[in-house]
C-alpha cells in the first residue's frame, strides 16, 4: 500500500455568513494523525504514535499550514452563491501518496453539504466535475473564484502538491511509521445459531500495519471464501486497526476448526473455545 497524507478541512456558513473557525483532521497512512484544536487554535497530535513521529519538535508548522488552509477555504465558501437559509458546509479533502516505485499522486476534492462537486488532479491540474446541475453550478462558482485569486495560479497547485509530499516525506523520515509493527490481539468467540449449528467469530484488534490475513481453517485447510463472512479492516482510533471473520459450523465439530492469522511475517492459530468457556484471548 502507498504511504499517504490526507488533509480534511471543513468550514461552515449559516444564513449566508461564513463562520469563524474551521474543523481540520490529518490522516497519515489512513490513521488519525493530527487535528486542529479550535479552543487552543493549535494542531494537536492524535495519540502517542503521532507524537513520536515528530519527536520533540513543535507543531508550529502544522498549525500555520492548517490555519492558512482554513482561511483560504473560508474565503472560497464566501464566494459560493448557493448560500441560503440554514447551515451549510464546504469541505476540502487533499490527499498525496508515495507508492512503492516512488511514483507520486495527489488530488484535491471539494464537497458542499457533503456532496462532491469538484475534484482536481494536482499533478496534471485536470479538473473533474460530477454531472449534476448543482455540482456544475457550484464548481463554476469555485473555479471562477480560484481563477480570480492571484494566489491560485499554476505555481500554487504545484506548491500544494509539493508541500503535501514534502510533509509526508518528513513524517516518514522519522522512521516511526515505517518501523512500526503492533501485533494483533486475537479473540475467538462462539454463539448459538440455528439448531445444531454455532457461529464462530475470530476478531483481530489493535494491530499495525493494516495488512492482515484472517481466515477460518477446517483440519488445517482454509475454508472457501463463500463460507466465511469478513468485516472491513477499520481504524480503531488508537493508531491501530481491527477486523473479524465468522463462519457457521456444526456443534460438536469445534475441535476441527481454527482461526488462522498472519501479520507482518508472523502467524498463529487460535482454537474455538469449548461451550463452557465463552472467550479465549491470546496475544502472540
Amino acid at each position: 500500500e502507498p504511504h499517504s497524507l490526507r488533509y480534511n478541512l471543513t468550514v461552515l456558513s449559516w444564513d449566508g455568513s461564513v463562520q469563524s473557525g474551521f474543523l481540520a483532521e490529518v490522516h497519515l497512512d489512513g490513521q488519525p494523525f493530527l487535528r486542529y484544536d479550535r479552543q487552543k487554535c493549535r494542531a494537536k497530535p492524535q495519540g502517542q504514535w503521532a507524537e513520536d513521529v515528530l519527536g520533540n519538535k513543535t507543531w508550529d508548522r502544522e498549525t500555520r499550514d492548517l490555519t492558512g488552509n482554513g482561511k483560504d477555504l473560508r474565503m472560497t465558501l464566501a464566494h459560493i452563491k448557493d448560500q441560503k437559509e440554514g447551515l451549510h458546509s464546504l469541505q476540502e479533502i487533499r490527499v498525496c501518496e508515495i507508492h512503492e516505485d516512488n511514483s507520486t499522486r495527489s488530488s484535491q476534492h471539494f464537497y458542499y453539504d457533503g456532496e462532491l462537486f469538484l475534484s482536481q488532479n494536482l499533478e496534471t491540474e485536470e479538473w473533474t466535475v460530477p454531472q449534476s446541475s448543482r455540482a456544475q453550478t457550484l464548481a463554476m462558482n469555485v473555479r471562477n473564484f480560484l481563477k480570480e485569486d492571484a494566489m491560485k495560479t499554476k505555481t500554487h497547485y504545484h506548491a500544494m502538491h509539493a508541500d503535501c509530499l514534502q510533509e509526508l516525506r518528513r513524517y516518514l523520515e522519522s522512521g516511526v511509521v515505517l518501523r512500526r509493527t503492533v501485533p494483533p490481539m486475537v479473540n475467538v468467540t462462539r454463539s448459538e445459531a440455528s439448531e445444531g449449528n454455532i457461529t464462530v467469530t475470530c476478531r483481530a484488534s489493535s494491530f499495525y500495519p493494516r495488512n492482515i490475513i484472517l481466515t477460518w481453517r477446517q483440519d488445517g485447510v482454509s475454508l472457501s471464501h463463500d463460507t466465511q463472512q469478513w468485516g472491513d479492516v477499520l481504524p480503531d482510533g488508537n493508531g491501530t486497526y481491527q477486523t473479524w471473520v465468522a463462519t457457521r459450523i456444526c456443534r460438536g465439530e469445534e475441535q476441527r476448526f481454527t482461526c488462522y492469522m498472519e501479520h507482518s511475517g508472523n502467524h498463529s492459530t487460535h482454537p474455538v473455545p469449548s461451550g463452557k468457556v465463552l472467550v479465549l484471548q491470546s496475544h502472540w
Epitope: 449559516w14 441560503k84 437559509e85 440554514g86 447551515l87
Partner: nanobody, 120 residues
Framework: QVQLVETGGGLVQPGGSLRLSCAAS????????IGWFRQAPGKEQEGVSC???????YYADSVKGRFTISRDNAKNTVYLQMNSLKPEDTAVYYC??????????????WAQGTQVTVSS
C-alpha cells in the same frame, strides 16, 4: 398548545444593550436548534443567530462580536444578548425553531416578534 414567546424588545440608544428572551411552551426547546431572525421595514428577513442543542453557536456577519446567543434548558428559554447596538439593528426580532434547516424561517414554530428600536 405549542408556542414561542419573545420578550425584552424596546427602545435603546446607539451603543446600548438589550437582552431578548424566547420562552417555549408545549414543547421542549433543548431538543431543537433555536435561532433569531429579524426584519426591518422594507427589507428582507435576515438570520441573526442560531444555537444548536449541543450549544454550538452561529452568527450573521453583521452581528459577530456584538451579539451573544445562549440557552437555559432548565427554563426552556433561549436568550439573545445584544451589545453595542446600532441604528441598523432596528427591526422586529423573531425566534424560531430548527434554525439549521434550509427553510427555518418558515418553520412550524416561530413567534410573534418583538420590536427593537435603536435611536437617539
Amino acid at each position: 398548545q405549542v408556542q414561542l414567546v419573545e420578550t425584552g424588545g424596546g427602545l435603546v440608544q446607539p451603543g446600548g444593550s438589550l437582552r431578548l428572551s424566547c420562552a417555549a411552551s408545549g414543547f421542549t426547546l433543548e431538543h431543537y436548534a433555536i435561532g433569531w431572525f429579524r426584519q426591518a421595514p422594507g427589507k428582507e428577513q435576515e438570520g441573526v443567530s442560531c444555537i444548536t442543542s449541543d450549544g454550538d453557536t452561529y452568527y450573521a456577519d453583521s452581528v459577530k462580536g456584538r451579539f451573544t446567543i445562549s440557552r437555559d434548558n432548565a427554563k426552556n428559554t433561549v436568550y439573545l444578548q445584544m451589545n453595542s447596538l446600532k441604528p441598523e439593528d432596528t427591526a422586529v426580532y423573531y425566534c424560531a425553531a430548527d434554525c439549521l434547516s434550509s427553510n427555518w424561517r418558515t418553520s412550524a414554530y416561530w413567534a410573534q416578534g418583538t420590536q427593537v428600536t435603536v435611536s437617539s
